[in-house]
């Protein structure tokens, strides 16, 4: 009834969980919104209250913590489902309060179904492996806190629909999946299913991630400008359209920002009083090496424009390069009637 700091619906935390599997969801207040943790709040006499709004309903209702086998429970700042049901989908709110203080946040929870090959509407994390780089591992994600260390779970790994066994270069090692050497053929969706017992019941956690094999840092080079180059001259007459492509190859580099830009007479095109447009296109190789093309276009070039310096620049974490385009004004072809006749000594 009294005022409550309402952080609204935290759509950044779009939580998706599989039907019929356990889910443990931490109240986002302590992770993103407040400067203190649950223990501090609890010892200060604050109480954490949970409630929810069902999918396609407006009515907020308390969560039923008295379901058979404690299917839904709360432990400290965690809301537990053991397991989820499809109709648990909705917006969940955790509220921290006492007589003088109140703060709350809501977040969406979606319970999704998977098919027999683990396909689902779940948004998949992407794990990048370097091509032919030596041993690399992926780890079954988001399974911490579900069972104590005394419990020894069973972990089964799948690639797509198939159990990973007798693969030449991929070896299941418990929670890890080791790639002895990664190839393009290792691209795909990998699923780990963790099976563990709890209170006389068996639970399963299914986690799928996408593996993308990318260029190795061993093979990475500074940007390479393929165009402009010394073999192509851009010869134009005033009034014609000038089109100069700048095409740059970037090796894949994790977390590198690849940049391409033009300068005209050492300035950015925006700072030059001419009608210039730049269109960019980007393409990727199978290993996520990148080719960026920026086409500089002047619709009706002037003789003044044809005297300017046009330089393409490129930068990545591996270095910076630049290349000037050779731009010339076309010498008009002689007109036969006057120039050639004079040349032949006609009178």
């Amino acid at each position: 009834s009294e005022r409550c700091d309402d952080w609204g619906l935290d759509t950044m935390r779009q939580i998706q969980v599989f039907e019929d599997e356990p889910a443990r969801i931490k109240c986002p207040l302590f992770e993103h919104f407040l400067k203190f943790n649950y223990s501090t709040a609890h010892s200060a006499g604050l109480t954490l209250i949970w409630y929810w709004t069902r999918q396609d309903r407006d009515l907020e209702e308390p969560i039923n913590f008295r379901l058979p086998e404690n299917r839904i429970s709360k432990e400290k700042d965690v809301l537990w489902f053991r397991p989820t049901l499809l109709n648990d989908t909705g917006n969940y709110t955790c509220m921290l309060r006492n007589t003088t203080y109140c703060s709350k946040v809501a977040f969406p929870l979606e319970v999704v179904q998977k098919d027999s090959c683990f396909n689902s509407p779940m948004k998949l994390p992407v794990h990048k492996l370097y091509i032919e780089y030596g041993i690399q591992r992926i780890t079954c994600p988001n399974v911490d806190g579900y069972f104590p260390s005394s419990v020894k779970p069973t972990i089964t790994w799948y690639m797509g629909c198939y159990k990973i066994q007798n693969f030449n270069n991929v070896i299941p090692e418990g929670m890890n999946l080791s790639f002895l050497i990664a190839f393009i053929s290792n691209n795909g969706n990998y699923t780990c299913v963790v099976t563990y017992p709890e209170n006389g019941r068996t639970f399963h956690l299914t986690r799928t991630l996408t593996v993308k094999v990318v260029g190795s840092p061993k093979n990475a080079v500074p940007p390479v400008i393929h165009s402009p180059n010394d073999h192509v001259v851009y010869e134009k007459e005033p009034g014609e359209e000038l089109l100069i492509p700048c095409t740059v190859y970037f090796s894949f580099l994790m977390d590198s920002r690849n940049e391409v830009w033009w300068t005209i007479d050492g300035k950015k095109p925006d700072d030059i009083p001419i009608d210039v447009t730049i269109n960019e296109s980007i393409s990727h190789s199978r290993t996520e090496d990148e080719t960026r093309t920026q086409i500089l276009s002047i619709k009706k070039v002037t003789s003044e424009d044809l005297k300017r310096s046009y330089v393409c620049h490129a930068r990545s974490a591996k270095g910076e390069v630049a290349k000037a385009a050779t731009v010339k004004q076309k010498v008009p072809a002689p007109r036969y009637t006057v120039e050639l006749a004079c040349g032949f000594g006609a009178t």
Partner: antibody, heavy 117, light 107 residues
Framework: QVQLQQSGPELLKPGASVKISCKAS????????MNWVKQRPGKGLEWIGR????????HYSGKFKGKATLTADKSSSIAYMQLSSLTSEDSAVYFC??????????WGQGTSVTVSS | DIQMTQTTSSLSASLGDRVTISCSAS??????LNWYQQKPDGTVKLLIH???GLHAGVPSRFSGSGSGTDYSLTISNLEPEDVATYYC?????????FGGGTKLEIK
Amino acid sequence: QVQLQQSGPELLKPGASVKISCKASGYAFSSSWMNWVKQRPGKGLEWIGRIYPGDGNTHYSGKFKGKATLTADKSSSIAYMQLSSLTSEDSAVYFCGEGYLDPMDYWGQGTSVTVSS
Amino acid sequence: DIQMTQTTSSLSASLGDRVTISCSASQGINNYLNWYQQKPDGTVKLLIHYTSGLHAGVPSRFSGSGSGTDYSLTISNLEPEDVATYYCQQYSILPWTFGGGTKLEIK
């Protein structure tokens, strides 16, 4: 508490067909495999096949292709196995078995099928 | 298809005994092996999955081990309710196949 309740015993003539059922409760029917297993009197267990009710995907043992047809009704959480062109060789107890993955975690009580002229 | 062999079709042991039942596969099955118990009344239960994973609710006197083609189920302290037939089953490659079963009786 997972429960699989199978339909009652069947006495049939050679050449007939039979459809036996397995009613599931206590888990998400659509998200687990339903297996079917045959046991001839005094003999061991033979895997017939399985169905994933969520998408209808089926796998059969080669020996039972053409003999058994597996279906599932998600709305009622019932799995079915139809056996066709029955002979005395089909006289057996048939079990359904639920598995989230490949192991059959929970089994039905079995349905006895007797083929006799 | 992968052939599963349980060489001992029946065995007799005393209460409190440690009993081991073995199972072999015609090719490597990468630990994808389950053990099931079928009681005299016909009811079937999963005991062990993935060679050594104890199924929920199964007493800890049951344990499994093995690798490659050779696997075993051990009952460490035989109880009267353990009278049953025990089946191994591979789930490495479809179709899943069972061993012929080992019938365990009390002396």
